[in-house]
Interface confidence: medium
């Protein structure tokens, strides 16, 4: 079997302040079972942006229907971008656990830069 890959096709995206940013992510396999999460930054201080399993993320919408049985697209859109949103975003696959999931593999990251709002 092929190794699961977490593909973030864009190394960087640039968005004007006030617009929405689409961050793309796709998996190459449905296995292992478990959720995906989006983070800004890496390491211990990373910030959770979206958790497929639980939580309320009012500015984040998923590009495709994640509950579809064979969905492999985990792209997200973040609305009303501000300069504070700049950073590198990682799409991370977790392996399902009870009570704790364990990280399986991360995408390479997409750097989001924010342009000034056009006047």
């Amino acid at each position: 079997e092929d190794e699961l890959q977490v593909i973030q096709p864009e190394k960087s995206v640039s968005v004007a302040a006030g617009e929405s940013a689409t961050l793309r992510c796709a998996m190459t396999s449905l296995i292992p079972v478990g959720p995906i999460m989006w983070f800004r930054g890496a390491g211990a201080g990373r910030e959770l942006i979206y958790n497929q399993k639980e939580g309320h993320f009012p500015r984040v919408t998923t590009v495709s229907e994640l509950t579809k049985r064979n969905n492999l697209d985990f792209s997200i859109s973040i609305s009303n971008i501000t300069p504070a949103d700049a950073g590198t975003y990682y799409c991370v696959k977790f392996r399902k656990g009870s009570p704790d999931d364990v990280e399986f593999k991360s995408g390479a990251g997409t750097e989001l830069s924010v342009r000034a709002k056009p006047s």
Epitope: D2, E3, P32, V102, E103, S106
Partner: antibody, heavy 124, light 107 residues
Framework: QVQLVQSGAEVKKPGASVKVSCKAS????????MVWVRQAPGQGLEWMGI????????SYAQKFQGRVTMTRDTSTSTVYMELSSLRSEDTAVYYC?????????????????WGQGTTVTVSS | DIQMTQSPSSLSASVGDRVTITCQAS??????LNWYQQKPGKAPKLLIY???NLETGVPSRFSGSRSGTDFTFTISSLQPEDIATYYC?????????FGGGTKVEIK
């Protein structure tokens, strides 16, 4: 060759803690999960938890939540399992084992390499 | 947690006999089941993964199969060196639970 070498036998008093080490060699340490399994005398195998050496994330069996801590040191390719508030029922052989598959298959598939086991005796 | 019910807990058979051990999962685990052999005083050894795939170097007399949530482990012709305890384990969802084990002895 691929191997896991564990620390030596330990004798502890009830209420104490024990920290068992497991040194990996012969493969890329961060490319495979490591699990801990224990076996009480005359009993079956009991899965305790798992650590992803790459990022350090862990998942523990509910039974051990709050008492077990699994860590790793990538510079020495070593994982550690610390069990606190020991009681007599924790007397067992503790094994570390590599979960094969992560890194070259789509998903992990089982413990393909095991340490030799560390006997922990809890007695007053 | 996923429960794995293994039977029998022990069995006695003659050299050359066909030996069968079963394991039932409490929910669908697809093919994500392993079988291990453990000899006294030794660490377990992975024999079969993904329900039916033989690990490298394992003799072909060992085999595994699946029917829904029921899994079967077979030794086609029992050898003296097969005296051990055998365990099933699911690996689809953490915690990776084991069956209770089956001790195989020679008559």
């Amino acid at each position: 060759q691929v191997q896991l070498v564990q620390s030596g036998a330990e004798v502890k008093k009830p209420g104490a803690s024990v920290k068992v080490s497991c040194k990996a060699s012969g493969y890329t340490f961060t490319s495979y999960y490591m699990v801990w399994v224990r076996q009480a005398p005359g009993q079956g195998l009991e899965w305790m938890g798992i650590i992803n050496p790459s990022g350090g994330s862990t998942s523990y069996a509910q039974k051990f939540q709050g008492r077990v801590t699994m860590t790793r040191d990538t510079s020495t390719s070593t994982v550690y399992m610390e069990l606190s508030s020991l009681r007599s029922e924790d007397t067992a052989v503790y094994y570390c084992a590599r979960e094969g598959g992560y890194g070259y298959r789509a998903y992990p598939y089982g413990m393909d390499v095991w340490g030799q086991g560390t006997t922990v005796t809890v007695s007053s | 947690d996923i429960q794995m019910t293994q039977s029998p807990s022990s069995l006695s058979a003659s050299v050359g006999d066909r030996v069968t051990i079963t394991c039932q999962a409490s929910q669908d685990i697809s093919n994500s089941l392993n079988w291990y052999q453990q000899k006294p005083g030794k660490a377990p050894k992975l024999l079969i993964y993904d329900a039916s795939n033989l690990e490298t170097g394992v003799p072909s007399r060992f085999s595994g199969s699946r029917s829904g949530t029921d899994f079967t482990f077979t030794i086609s012709s029992l050898q003296p060196e097969d005296i051990a305890t055998y365990y099933c384990q699911q690996v689809i969802i953490l915690p990776l639970t084991f069956g209770g084990g089956t001790k195989v002895e020679i008559k």
